[in-house]
Interface confidence: medium
């Protein structure tokens, strides 16, 4: 069940966002959340992700970008980006959306 | 550029097996998640199964206990063993991988897709 915390190893993340207590967390796996809202910048939070494994799974859109690993510090130095609108059944072999 | 190359689709009858592979190739630095969609005609593409490079796995509720993904680090592939194969499986098969390739920027790349018929 995706809802419930993980209970595997945990892992030391980066964390950037407004609700990290410190430079990093310990997760089941690490996060890079790109958001884009309207008329503003797109805002990149790192974490870490214990709940909810089921937005692990999403595929980037023109507005978020939710991205997963689990590996050391894995989120660090990660640079995310937004896709276009095109769904990928339209662009067969190629990268992104 | 990452490209992707799919194979093990075809047609197997109902309560049969078939075992999906997908490799990866070109400027890898580092491959995260990597795992597979399917799209069945008339229907938006929907998620099956990922794992992340530590092991970390995640099933849709249709596939659990039915389908097992893996993947081997080292050369860069992903396997779907798809056991107890359903009429409503039938659909075809993206394999997707979420990679670094200049140490800095991550994104999805996407196979061409396989097609697996499941049929008496």
């Known amino acids: 069940d995706p809802v419930k915390p993980s209970r595997g190893p945990l892992v030391t993340c980066t964390c950037e966002s407004p609700h990290c207590k410190g430079p990093t967390c310990r997760g089941a796996w690490c996060t890079v959340v790109l958001v884009r809202e309207e008329g503003r910048h797109p805002q990149e939070h790192r974490g870490c992700g214990n709940l909810h494994r089921e937005l692990c799974r999403g595929r980037p859109t023109e507005f978020v970008n939710h991205y997963c690993c689990d590996s050391h510090l894995c989120n660090h130095n990660v640079s995310l980006v937004l896709e276009a609108t095109q769904p990928p059944s339209e662009q067969p072999g190629t990268d992104g959306q | 550029q990452v490209q992707l190359v799919e194979s093990g689709g075809g047609l197997v009858q109902p309560g049969g097996s078939l075992r999906l592979s997908c490799a990866a190739s070109?400027?890898?630095?580092?491959?995260?998640?990597m795992g597979w969609f399917r799209q069945a005609p008339g229907n938006e593409r929907e998620f099956v199964a990922f794992?992340?490079?530590?092991?970390?796995?995640d099933y849709a509720d249709s596939v659990k206990g039915r389908f097992t993904i893996s993947r081997d680090n080292a050369k860069k592939t992903v396997t779907l063993q798809m056991n107890s194969l359903k009429a409503e499986d039938t659909a075809v098969y993206y394999c997707?991988?979420?990679?670094?390739?200049?140490?800095?920027?991550?994104?999805?790349?996407w196979g061409q897709g396989t097609l697996v018929t499941v049929s008496s």
């Open positions: 070109g400027s890898i630095f580092r491959l995260e998640s």
């Open positions: 794992m992340l490079s530590g092991g970390t796995t």
């Open positions: 997707y991988v979420e990679a670094t390739t200049d140490r800095i920027g991550i994104k999805r790349y």
